[in-house]
């Protein structure tokens, strides 16, 4: 029951925590900055992995894309490709979790198939839960350092003049979502690998029988298999009591030359 | 790289009007606004009027009334439309351009090459 619950709980908080993954990929707040000297109105700059925004006090709201993929910072780049391994691999851990829940019966898989599976979700999930973690805070660590923008410098550029304005990039919400998110993606991870060694079966214990002989007509065969000429109804040679057999559960035994424990 | 373009300038009698024209191109991120400055001869370069992309605009005191900016978004477009123009308008009109570029490479304010306008008899 223990196992069943740790194993659920796991597939849930994976759950929840590969959706924050995948919101914080898709959100726009990935860094904030706040202009309060413009001479117009209120105007607030975020971005995020995909796009930039502008949104004035006024509620108007514009974003565009990236213009070009080889133009963007290797940093940016990274971010993008382990935000989505992230994702990726906590997709398909989600798909092998479901098949491995304890509480789904899927036709006679054995203990030990959903223990595998419910082990490499679990992995699936540590590993996606890390690569989101590791993404938000690359891009954190890019706008601490703030490399881009340590001076306000002018020159003259294309066509006319250009000056860089001394700016500051804050942590919007999807860094907070995405190490949220991460964090439960991870313990949802470690939660299925719990889960796994309360899943996989013990080493099969047969309780220790004793044989009595019942009468002389009766033929015991080393190891307690009935003989059979592969013709007959025991082809797979399932271990026979007959009725001189007693567990020990059951009855008091002696030791004889027939007893095979 | 981001070109601004001007166009519309040129000489017009006291009391004319002029129509000035600037776009904007090439890797146009977010546009917080756009306007308009001038720089008479022997004078400090001032703002004339600028406009944000949803429309809100500031003039330069004196100029409200005489002066209307406006945008077209999808063109990445400003213009100023100038009238009953007097000779203190002389000045060399520059179109002014502040992007935002974030992660990519900050804010930045971008400047037109100019474009002159003679008010004169």
């Known amino acids: 029951m223990a196992v069943t619950a740790c194993q659920g709980l796991g597939f849930v908080v994976s759950l929840i925590g590969i959706a924050g993954i995948i919101a914080a990929t898709c959100m726009d707040q990935w860094s904030t900055q706040d202009l309060y000297n413009n001479p117009v109105t209120a105007v607030f700059n975020y971005q995020g992995l995909w796009r930039s925004c502008v949104r004035e006090s006024s509620g108007f709201t514009e974003c565009r894309g990236y213009f070009t993929l080889l133009g963007l910072p290797a940093m940016l780049q990274a971010v993008r490709a382990l935000m989505i391994v992230g994702i990726v691999l906590g997709a398909i851990g989600l798909l092998v979790s479901i098949f491995a829940l304890k509480c789904i019966r899927i036709g006679s898989m054995e203990d030990s198939a959903k223990a595998n599976m419910t082990l490499t979700s679990g992995i699936m999930f540590i590993v996606s839960g890390l690569c989101a973690i590791a993404g938000v805070s690359v891009f954190a660590n890019m706008l601490v350092t703030n490399f881009w923008m340590s001076t306000a410098n002018m020159y003259t550029g294309m066509g006319g003049m250009v000056q860089t304005v001394q700016t500051r990039y804050t942590f919007g919400a999807a860094l907070f979502v995405g190490w949220v998110a991460g964090g439960l993606t991870l313990i949802g991870g470690v939660m299925m690998c719990i889960a796994c060694r309360g899943l996989a079966p013990e080493e099969t214990n047969y309780k220790a029988v004793s044989y009595h002989a019942s009468g002389h007509s009766v033929a015991y065969k080393p190891g307690g298999f009935k003989a059979s000429t592969g013709f007959g109804s025991n082809t797979k040679n399932k271990k026979i009591y007959d009725g001189g057999a007693r567990t020990e559960d059951e009855v008091q035994s002696y030791p004889s030359k027939h007893d095979y424990v | 790289e981001v070109q601004l373009v001007e166009s519309g300038g040129g000489l017009v009698q006291p009391g004319g009007s002029l129509r000035l024209s600037c776009a904007a191109s090439g890797n146009i991120l977010s546009i917080n606004y756009m306007g308009w400055y001038r720089q008479a001869p022997g004078k400090e370069r001032e703002l004339v009027a600028t406009?944000?992309?949803?429309?809100?605009?500031n003039y330069q005191g004196n100029l409200k009334g005489r002066f209307i900016i406006s945008g077209d978004n999808t063109k990445d477009t400003v213009y100023l439309q100038m009238n009953n123009l007097q000779p203190e308008d002389t000045a060399v009109y520059y179109c002014y351009f502040r992007i935002n570029f974030g992660i990519l490479g900050g804010l930045r304010d971008y400047w037109g090459q100019g474009t002159q306008v003679t008010v004169s008899s």
């Open positions: 406009i944000t992309r949803g429309g809100s605009t």
